[in-house]
């Protein structure tokens, strides 16, 4: 009876996500067979989040809308470890929008999910950000510094990275 109700709950939860994500990849969390964490297929997972590299080129606003439709946001990077994981899936000759912007042009950077912007946990390339007109952040590769952030014009199409919380069933 317990197993039956748990299965029913799982199925109803899966149905919620089905319109955006027809296929989920789930792994057992810990030793308890009852706890599964899932990411949409073919998203990648790291800690408690799922990540999707969008290779379509869009402006920052359209990229964020695109992530939103999938139940996600443009990526918010909270730690060096998280960035190190993300860059494993990026191409060196491409740039990718982050969920970081300065819409007022006053150097008040803000994350899309309202995570406080912490100057101590940022990975700007040296000399960046450097232009008040460039109000959106990308992550890209520079041979001298490897991967880091740069400010660019928001309307210039780039690839992007979406991030969502893992789905627990």
């Amino acid at each position: 009876n317990f197993m039956y109700s748990k299965t029913v709950k799982r199925l109803s939860k899966l149905r919620e996500y089905q319109q955006y994500h027809p296929s989920l990849t789930c792994v057992m969390e810990g030793k308890d067979i009852e706890d599964w964490s899932c990411c949409p297929t073919p998203w990648t997972s790291f800690q408690s989040s799922c990540y999707f590299i969008s290779t379509g080129m869009q402006s920052w606003t359209k990229s964020q809308k695109n992530c939103s439709v999938m139940g996600a946001d443009l990526v918010v990077i909270n730690t060096r470890e998280e960035q190190d994981f993300i860059i494993q899936n990026l191409k060196r000759n491409s740039s990718y929008f982050l969920g970081l912007s300065d819409p007022g042009g006053r150097r008040h950077w803000q994350w899309v999910d309202q995570t406080p912007y912490n100057e101590n946990v940022t990975f700007w390339h040296s000399g960046e950000p450097n232009n008040l007109d460039e109000r959106c952040a990308i992550i890209n590769f520079r041979s001298s510094e490897e991967w880091g952030w740069n400010d660019i014009h928001c309307h210039v199409p780039q690839k992007s990275i979406c991030k969502m919380k893992k789905i627990y069933i």
Partner: antibody
Framework: EVQLLESGGGLVQPGGSLRLSCAAS????????MSWVRQAPGKGLEWVAT????????YYPDSVKGRFTISRDNSKNTLYLQMNSLRAEDTAVYYC??????????????WGQGTTVTVSS | DIVMTQSPDSLAVSLGERATINCKAS??????????VNWYQQKPGQPPKLLIY???NLESGVPDRFSGSGSGTDFTLTISSLQAEDVAVYYC?????????FGGGTKVEIK
């Protein structure tokens, strides 16, 4: 008062090259993103190129990518547009304009009087 | 690319009467409560002049008989009381995503 003065237009044969200049005054040129916009005879407006204040980021539509190069010399307060492999359809009045950001978008708020480029054999 | 379609192509209005120009974007140009559409006026032999930005914000120095409205994909420029000096071609433009694109223009004349 903001002033933008384009020069360098003229008659050129198909396949030829031309360099347009835009002399800026009345504002701090080195802090402004700048753009070129063109208008074919009797037609509408078409964005051609944009360059950020430092000159390290440039953007073009597909119609001119690989043929046109936007650049700037902040010490001379001058914007340039190098146009190569010119075609008949590049015939237009070319305007330089200042770019002003508006949240995630932008406006082109000051425009020069334009310089005419004619591509014909 | 985002296509901006203006209507009508031309418009003849009596002095003092209202002129309305429409602009339709092929996809939404909104984000977070702002619309990334601008309107320009171009008089014969002159460069374009910015009138309205962000769909509804009047540029400094522009007479308040000009107004803009709309959101999403549908935008309107209104001249509440047409003056002789308003004879011009009017263009909408989106700045949400490169390439920036302009409408084909609407020619406003006096009837």
């Amino acid at each position: 008062e903001v002033q933008l003065l384009e020069s360098g237009g003229g008659l050129v044969q198909p396949g030829g090259s031309l360099r347009l200049s835009c002399a800026a005054s009345g504002f701090t040129f080195s802090t402004y993103t700048m753009s070129w916009v063109r208008q074919a005879p009797g037609k509408g407006l078409e964005w051609v190129a944009t360059i950020n204040s430092g000159g390290d980021n440039t953007y073009y539509p597909d119609s001119v990518k690989g043929r046109f190069t936007i650049s700037r010399d902040n010490s001379k307060n001058t914007l340039y547009l190098q146009m190569n492999s010119l075609r008949a359809e590049d015939t237009a009045v070319y305007y330089c304009a200042t770019y002003r950001p508006y949240y995630y978008g932008s406006v082109l708020d000051y425009w020069g009087q334009g310089t005419t480029v004619t591509v014909s054999s | 690319d985002i296509v901006m379609t203006q209507s009508p192509d031309s418009l003849a209005v009596s002095l003092g009467e209202r002129a309305t120009i429409n602009c339709k974007a092929s996809q939404s140009v909104d984000y977070d409560g702002n619309s990334y559409v601008n309107w320009y006026q171009q008089k014969p032999g002159q460069p374009p002049k910015l009138l309205i930005y962000g769909a509804s914000n009047l540029e400094s120095g522009v007479p308040d008989r000009f107004s803009g409205s709309g959101s999403g994909t549908d935008f309107t420029l209104t001249i509440s009381s047409l003056q002789a000096e308003d004879v011009a071609v009017y263009y909408c433009q989106q700045s949400d995503e490169d390439p920036w694109t302009f409408g084909g223009g609407t020619k406003v004349e006096i009837k």
